[in-house]
Every structure is written in C-alpha cells, then in structure tokens.
C-alpha cells in the first residue's frame, strides 16, 4: 500500500477525515521539523490552519524579529505560528486568509481574502493580498498594496515613526495602517481610546481594542 502523505496543512488533515477542531502536526515544505498547529474544522467548511490567535491576554506579543520569525505561544491558546512557517506554508500552494474578530460586546465579524501569501525573510515577510470580503468593514483593514513586517527591533514601516514600538507587537505596519492584531490586550472597560491595542479599523474604529482574534489560512482549491 502506498505510504500516506504527511499533512501539509489543516486542509490535508480535514480531507484525511479528521474533522474535529484541535491541535494537529503538519509537515511544511522546506522546513526541517514538523509543526504543531491549531486546526479550525468548524468555520466556513473547516480545513483552516490557524496562524494567530488572541483570546485572553495571557501571552506577551511585544516581541522581537526572531520570535516573530519562529513563532511563540501554544496552539492550544494564544500564539503566533511564525513568519518563517507562514512563508513556507503559503509557498506550497495558493491560500486564502480568513480573520475572525470579536469585540467586547460579543459582536463577531470576519474579513476574508481570496489570495494571501508573504515574502521570505529577505523581503521582510512582505504581505500580499487580493480580494477582500466580509462583515468586518467594507474596506480592508490590512494593507492591500503590500507592507513589510515590522517588530520592535526591525523598523520596516512606512512612517517617520517606529510603529512597532509605538503600537506594540509585530505587524504589517504602513504608517501605521488600519490594523494591528498583535497589539496590547486590554480588558473590558479599558479597551477604548487605545493607540496600541488590538485594532481592526474598519470594524471598530482607530482606538478600540478587540477581545479576540483568529487569523487562519486555507488552500484556495479546498
């Protein structure tokens, strides 16, 4: 019998018959080690590989380039998968991106992009997106014309300022752009008027810090 192919992403996991959300091990092209990821098998047909999750403020997202490169946190809770892994996965085939958001009033919304990939480290993990839809605003809160990734120790933004230091977290900042899902976590009542919170401009405005966020990717041909 032909040997089973290892899972490249959560879409492969789902198509192999595993349709419960949870932690699975995937084998990404050109990466020496397998990677544990959270697979969301419930939203919009399932098969989503979660690359970022915020829910309770238990994890510090104010980290440097190397940590954002290799990832941090735990896929069972808050985590960032790692830019190197996101680059490797999205180089395997064409992917879409879905971002699930929830505010402190319990309202849920999403933004979805038909195409998503990022450049390699030499390209500062530059963001490439196409085709925005969803309920989290008519306009995209991610920079569609491309933005480089910045962290507190790597200023690659398009501002006279240092966005990652000022707004905290690593993100595809412009000057500084309409979003930052890796900003500071603020609890209910403290989440208004925040410059450096978890922001999705076209959902809740420029200074509202969100309660939870999930970024996840799935192959276009799923």
């Amino acid at each position: 019998r032909e040997e089973e192919k290892p899972f490249r992403d959560c879409a492969d996991v789902y198509q192999a018959g595993f349709n419960k959300s949870g932690i699975y091990t995937i084998y990404i092209n050109n990466m020496p080690e397998p990677k544990k990821v959270f697979c969301n098998m419930d939203v919009n047909g399932g098969g989503w590989t979660v690359i970022q999750h915020r829910e309770d403020g238990s994890l510090d997202f104010q980290r440097g380039w190397k940590e954002y490169k290799m990832g941090f946190g735990n896929p069972s809770g808050e985590y960032w998968l790692g830019n190197e892994f996101i680059f490797a996965i999205t180089s395997q085939r064409q992917y879409m991106l879905r971002i699930e958001l929830m505010d402190w009033e319990g309202n849920r919304a999403y933004s979805q992009y038909d195409r998503f990939h990022i450049g390699n480290e030499k390209q500062n993990y530059r963001l490439y997106l196409k085709g925005h839809t969803g309920t989290a605003g008519k306009q995209s809160s991610l920079i569609l014309h491309g933005a480089d990734f910045s962290t507190k120790d790597a200023d690659n933004d398009n501002c006279m300022c240092k966005c990652a230091l000022m707004l905290t977290g690593g993100w595809w900042f412009d000057a500084c752009g309409p979003s930052n899902l890796n900003g500071m976590f603020y609890t209910a009542g403290q989440n208004h008027g925040k410059l450096n919170g978890i922001k999705w401009h076209y959902f809740k405005g420029p200074s509202y810090s969100l309660r939870s966020t999930t970024m996840m990717i799935r192959p276009l041909d799923f």
Partner: antibody, heavy 122, light 112 residues
C-alpha cells in the same frame, strides 16, 4: 518622496477673501488627516484648522471660526483653506501639515508644506 | 486652551556642548491611553518646521540620536547631547492631548 506644495498666498485688503491650496504627492492622501498652521511675522506657530482623512470631521481655532473653511478633494490629492473676511491679524505664513500617522490617529505633524505668505493690508 | 511655556527663550551654546530646553504645560498631557501627546519641532532659519520628537520621547526617523525627549504629565525636556552648527533655529514644543493643539512660544538656539 512625500511632498506638500502650497500656492495661493498674496496681498489682500481687509474684508476680502483668499483661497490657499496644498497639493500632496508621494503618499496616499486619502488616508491622512491634514492641518493648517500659521506663523505671524517674527512670531511663533499657531494651529488654524484640521480636516480628517475623509473630510467628515473638521475643527477650527476660535480666532478663525466662521471666517475660514477647510476642505479637501481626495480625488485631486489637494487640501484647501478658504479665507473670508480677512483681518490684519491674519497676516502670516500659512503652512499645510500632514498627520504623522494615517487613519486619523493624532500624534502631531510628520510633514509640512513650504509655507505661503498671506498679507492683509489696506 | 492649554498654555505651553518654554524656557529659556534664547539659548546660546558652544558647539560640542550639551543643551537643554524645558517645556511646561498648564494641564497634564498624560492621556488616558498612557501616552503624552507632546512633540518637539525645529524650525531652521528660512525653513518649515520639522518633527524631532513625538509622544514625548520617540525620535522621528532621520533625527540624529543626539536629540532626546523626556518627561511626563506637565514637565518635558528636549536635550541635545552635543550641539552642532546645523542645530541652530527655533525649537517648539506642541501638545496634542487636549484640543486645540497648542505650541510653546519657541526657544531660539544660537551658536556662541
């Protein structure tokens, strides 16, 4: 390269009108709040007016309220200041200035125009 | 409106020596979000103002590291560790915490 190029200054009699323009290039104009700041001869800086990126929010200094009108045309990447009922005390170099940050996050002025002199004199 | 008071108004400095400018506000500039909306600008002779420091202490891109900003609440300081000839001009502090934005009266730095 970010550029703010101003025009429209000149000498005008008290009570008359003047319109200043500020042509923006090198950035996404429609993403930034814009301001007018003035400087009387030999004096310090005074904020005059602000307009948000979409034009939906506008503020004026008390000294010009009811006489000056700020506006923008995002399709033309241009900012304007319509100055009516001009007074001698409006004599100043007028600067257009761009917010440092986009999406109406206020942290000061990142870029300034070259300035244009308005002289109100009979 | 918030009154911004700078001192000294005139500052003669020898090149290579440090310089310090004080800026005091009539009300606290510490915003509820934890930031002080206090900027420093330099207007060189015959030029438009340029941003040096934003949010009290963050240096704008391209500004030499000999410039530093500090302070919180009502008292702020701009320091130049070693003054150079190109630093001459008028320095303004500006607050943006309370609307409308207001400027200090300016400090003229000149070379001795």
């Amino acid at each position: 390269e970010v550029q703010l190029v101003q025009s429209g200054g000149g000498v005008v009699q008290p009570g008359r009108s003047l319109r200043l323009s500020c042509a923006a290039s090198g950035f996404t104009f429609s993403s930034y709040g814009m301001h007018w700041v003035r400087q009387a001869p030999g004096k310090g800086l005074e904020w005059v007016s602000y307009i948000s990126s979409s034009g939906s929010t506008i503020y004026y200094a008390d000294s010009v309220k009811g006489r000056f009108t700020i506006s923008r045309d995002n399709a033309k990447n241009s900012l304007y200041l319509q100055m009516n009922s001009l007074r001698a005390e409006d004599t100043a170099v007028y600067y257009c200035a761009r917010d440092l940050l986009d999406y109406d996050i206020w942290t000061g002025y990142g870029y300034w125009g070259q300035g244009t002199l308005v002289t109100v004199s009979s | 409106d918030i009154v911004m008071t700078q001192s000294p108004l005139s500052l003669p400095v020898t090149p290579g020596e440090p310089a310090s400018i004080s800026c005091r506000s009539s009300q606290s500039l510490l915003h509820s979000n934890g930031y002080n909306y206090l900027d420093w600008y330099l207007q060189k002779p015959g030029q438009s103002p340029q941003l040096l420091i934003y949010l009290g202490s963050d240096r704008a891109s391209g500004v030499p590291d000999r410039f530093s900003g500090s302070g919180s609440g009502t008292d702020f300081t701009l320091k130049i560790s070693r003054v150079e000839a190109e630093d001459v001009g008028v320095y303004y502090c500006m607050q943006g915490t309370h609307w409308p934005p207001t400027f200090g009266q300016g400090t003229k730095l000149e070379i001795k």
